[in-house]
Interface confidence: low
């Protein structure tokens, strides 16, 4: 997704925001969390 | 290292009120979801509620919603659980723990005890 | 809710054995990114519960290469491949897929 619908996604999930760091490991992709966002965005 | 100590716990009676504090150390607080999770004595574990890095976000358990409100200061790393009209089976060690992606319950802390007695 | 349940609800195993666990949901834990969020926990007796498997099968970091997990769907598995000591406890899967999250109800190993 392009900035603009990423940063909404973000500002509406639940759960972490983009500046998650990593804490021993990671636990999922960048990826993921871009797929995570948009799964609450479309589940509200 | 990464940290979470609950605080606040105690006895109450029925009806009335009791605020938990959980305070962070360790990682970027303002970057994570925040869950508490209960367990009754010599029971299972319910989750309760989640709150998002940012606040603006929350969900709740059937069981405690409109009587608990969870609440978070990015400020002094501090997430809180507002318990009202607290109930005989809301009795058990309240836990705070950070949310990964996924919610992931990654960092657990090591639990206050909530007593409702009469 | 998606009800989580555990087989056995308790296991002694003997020292240096293997140990499974498994745990069923009612519906399938597959989300609509694919993932599939159903996480083990580990309680020692005194302790807060501990991040052992996340996502089915992945450690989190600083657990031991023993404990794995696997499965799909609605039926999952956690396995000890040589049980130890500090292994005895209480151990949890949880479902973090749809609200409200749900845990099973727990599975106590303990040594025979």
């Known amino acids: 997704g392009g900035g603009g619908s990423k940063h909404k996604c973000v500002q509406n999930s639940l759960v972490n925001n983009e500046t998650l760091e990593s804490i021993m490991n990671t636990l999922e992709s960048e990826e993921d969390f871009r797929k995570y966002f948009y799964y609450l965005e479309g589940s509200k | 290292q990464v940290q979470l100590v609950e605080s606040g716990g105690g006895v109450v009676q029925p009806g009335r009120s009791l605020r938990l504090s959980c305070a962070a150390s360790?990682?970027?607080?303002?970057?994570?979801?925040m869950h508490w999770v209960r367990q009754a004595p010599g029971k299972g574990l319910e989750w309760v509620a989640v709150?998002?890095?940012?606040?603006?976000?929350?969900h709740f358990a059937d069981s405690v919603k409109g009587r608990f409100t969870i609440s978070r200061d990015n400020s002094k790393n501090t997430l809180n659980l507002q318990m009202n009209s607290l109930r005989a089976e809301d009795r058990a060690v309240y836990y705070c723990?950070?949310?990964?992606?996924?919610?992931?319950?990654?960092?657990w802390g090591q639990g206050t005890m909530v007593t409702v007695s009469s | 809710d998606i009800v989580m349940t555990q087989t056995p609800l308790s296991s002694p195993v003997t020292l240096g054995q293997p140990a499974s666990i498994s745990c069923r949901s009612s519906?399938?834990?597959?989300?609509?990114?694919?993932?599939?969020?159903l996480s083990w926990l580990q309680q020692r007796p005194g302790q807060p519960p501990r991040l052992l498997i996340y996502?089915?099968?992945n450690r989190f970091s600083g657990v031991p290469d023993r404990f794995s997990g696997s499965g799909a769907g609605t039926d999952f598995t956690l396995k000890i491949s040589r049980v130890e000591a500090e292994d005895v406890g209480i151990y949890f899967c949880?479902?973090?897929?749809?609200?409200?999250?749900?845990f099973g109800p727990g599975t106590k190993v303990d040594i025979k």
């Open positions: 723990a950070r949310g990964a992606s996924g919610f992931v319950l990654d960092i």
């Open positions: 360790g990682f970027t607080f303002s970057s994570y979801g």
């Open positions: 709150i998002s890095y940012d606040g603006n976000n929350k």
């Open positions: 519906q399938s834990l597959v989300r609509s990114d694919g993932n599939t969020y």
């Open positions: 996502k089915i099968s």
């Open positions: 949880m479902q973090t897929t749809q609200f409200p999250f749900t």
